[in-house]
Interface confidence: low
């Protein structure tokens, strides 16, 4: 009598998550009489997947009619596959008895599930940094299978090399996660720059997933300050200008100090953007020279994005300007309230 063979022709089957998996199994003989059962895994902890006689297996259906006379095909189809279904499936023949006795097992078919990685999420540094400093961006994607995956970083289309990438877990798993950190050296021109994390995986068929982050969220470009005096007007008023240039972000407060005393405070808002994404701002102060006996020290004080204030001072030389008659007396009488500073 020919020995019964349980034939599982495929050593492995790969299925996309959500699809159906067909696990093939045929037997070489109708005898001895007894049922076929499907298990995931081997040994005492194996999991029953399908048993024609009893149990409820809503996602498992036989490929051919198992009640048909002389049926030797015990292949099954598992619907709506998820990564949790991965594993090695065994078709096992039992000899009828009380209880049934395991007779022979197929060689097993390893089911691997192809699952797409989630959209990469890129997160940047918690605090802004200035040019020439290095900041780190992190990219994460989850839930993919198989483990092989490619992750690349780009800044303005150019691939970054200072990258550290880990795929977890290291061992066998139903699905995997990837986490990568890229270190980027900032330049003053990076307000409009973008970093891209690109993930390529077998399930994506050549259309990589991308996550992006704008360097505008990570960079601070400190302003340049310049204080200048315009030529004196006919009414003895001097126009002093504070030019604040090439700064980012827009959050900026400017304070004028006259001989150390606060004269006026302004907040930047709705400024036009430079081509490189930075901002410029100009503030003017009119000083009535005839109202002063001594030189006036004007200070333009700028607080940018919560950073310590930056000062630029300028002395208006009162002695260099002719006074109107009686103006000294007037200045002494009026005190500090009427300095004609606007």
């Amino acid at each position: 009598e020919e020995e019964l063979q349980v034939i599982q022709p495929e050593k492995s089957v790969s299925v996309a998550a959500g699809d159906s998996a067909t696990l093939n199994c045929t037997v070489s003989s109708l005898i001895p009489v007894g049922p076929i059962q499907w298990f995931r895994g081997a040994g005492p902890g194996r999991e029953l997947i399908y048993n024609l006689k009893e149990g409820h297996f809503p996602r498992v259906t036989p490929v051919s009619d198992p009640t048909k006379r002389n049926n030797m095909d015990f292949s099954i189809r598992i619907s709506n596959i998820t990564p949790a279904d991965a594993g090695t499936y065994y078709c096992v023949k039992f000899r009828k008895g009380s209880p049934d006795v395991e007779l022979k097992s197929g060689a097993g078919t390893e089911l691997s599930v192809r699952a797409k990685p989630s959209a990469p999420v890129v997160s940047g540094p918690a605090v802004r940094a200035t040019a020439e400093h290095t900041v780190s961006f992190t990219c994460e994607s989850h839930g993919f299978s198989p483990r092989d995956i490619t992750l690349k970083w780009f800044k303005n289309g150019n691939e970054l090399s200072d990258v550290q990438t880990n795929v977890d877990p290291a061992g066998k798993s139903v699905s995997y996660s990837i986490r990568s950190t890229a270190r980027v050296v900032l330049t003053r021109r990076d307000v409009h720059s973008q970093v891209i994390c690109e993930v390529a995986h077998v399930t994506l068929q050549g259309d990589p997933l991308r996550g992006t982050a704008n360097l505008s969220e990570a960079i601070r470009v400190p302003p340049f300050l310049e204080v200048t005096q315009q030529s004196m007007r006919a009414d003895n008023q001097v126009n002093v200008t504070c030019q604040v240039t090439k700064f980012y972000p827009q959050r900026l407060q400017l304070t004028w100090l006259e001989n150390g005393n606060v004269s006026r405070t302004e907040m930047a808002s709705a400024l036009p953007e430079n081509k490189d994404g930075t901002y410029n701002w100009t503030s003017w102060l009119l000083v009535n020279v005839s109202a002063h006996r001594d030189d006036v020290k004007l200070t333009c004080q700028v607080e940018h994005d919560g950073q310590p204030a930056v000062n630029k001072s300028f002395s208006v030389k009162v002695s260099a300007h002719p006074k109107e008659q009686g103006s000294n007396t007037a200045a002494e009488n009026t005190g500090t309230n009427e300095r004609n500073i606007y």
């Epitope: 289309g157 390529a200 068929q205 050549g206």
Partner: antibody, heavy 118, light 112 residues
Framework: QVQLQESGPGLVKPSGTLSLTCAVS?????????WSWVRQPPGKGLEWIGE???????NYNPSLKSRVTISVDKSKNQFSLKLSSVTAADTAVYYC??????FGVGPWGQGTLVTVSS | DIVMTQSPLSLPVTPGEPASISCRSS???????????LDWYLQKPGQSPQLLIY???NRASGVPDRFTGSGSGTDFTLKISRVEAEDVGVYYC?????????FGQGTKVEIK
């Protein structure tokens, strides 16, 4: 959806240089893909010419390597093929195509027939 | 170079019937990562080739499930469970394991 379009002269003189450009639309040439050239002589099968990655790395068919140059222009989102010292045997439909890191070649351009003749 | 050999070179088919094409490589296309770097393409008359199957057994996006790729190592098969009139054309296998990428000679499928 990524689409590719070949362009270039349809007639090249023997010993001259064949030059073709492939414009990529609907996607970035800087993505994780290789950009390929494949040709098909009239009535014959497919022959792989070579491929380029956006970084400039190239792979060429050894049988053509001495005559082939593939280059990429990221600013124009296109890549190009130059085949020098052509003969009548180089008459073929030339296809540009994308090859993913993990998958086969596709999509393909519609192909352009280049005839080598005086 | 890896040599790809297809058979048959011509395959007359009847609509509704199954069809099978074989592709053999001169060396194993099984990578250490477990994938077989073998693709199948269909070139319909007057058209560019289109990707059907990649990495041995994975159907490309939009490809009907009547197309199935199988095999490992050096022997691969493309099966069409029920041929339809629109399936006529030349089928090519291609190895992507090494450069130069190499194609089979092609199998011409036509309706009987």
């Amino acid at each position: 959806q990524v689409q590719l379009q070949e362009s270039g002269p349809g007639l090249v003189k023997p010993s001259g240089t064949l030059s073709l450009t492939c414009a990529v639309s609907g996607g970035s040439i800087s993505s994780s893909n290789w950009w390929s050239w494949v040709r098909q002589p009239p009535g014959k099968g497919l022959e792989w010419i070579g491929e380029i990655y956006h970084s400039g790395s190239t792979n060429y068919n050894p049988s053509l390597k001495s005559r082939v140059t593939i280059s990429v222009d990221k600013s124009k989102n296109q890549f190009s093929l130059k085949l020098s010292s052509v003969t009548a045997a180089d008459t073929a439909v030339y296809y540009c195509a994308r090859r993913g890191i993990w998958f086969g070649v596709g999509p393909w351009g519609q192909g352009t027939l280049v005839t080598v003749s005086s | 170079d890896i040599v790809m050999t297809q058979s048959p070179l011509s395959l007359p088919v009847t609509p509704g019937e199954p069809a099978s094409i074989s592709c053999r490589s001169s060396q194993s296309l099984l990578h250490g990562n477990g994938f077989n770097y073998l693709d199948w393409y269909l070139q319909k008359p007057g058209q560019s080739p289109q990707l059907l199957i990649y990495l041995g057994s994975n159907r490309a996006s939009g490809v009907p499930d009547r197309f199935t790729g199988s095999g490992s190592g050096t022997d691969f098969t493309l099966k069409i469970s029920r041929v339809e009139a629109e399936d006529v054309g030349v089928y090519y296998c291609m190895q992507g394991l090494q450069t130069p990428r190499t194609f089979g000679q092609g199998t011409k499928v036509e309706i009987k």
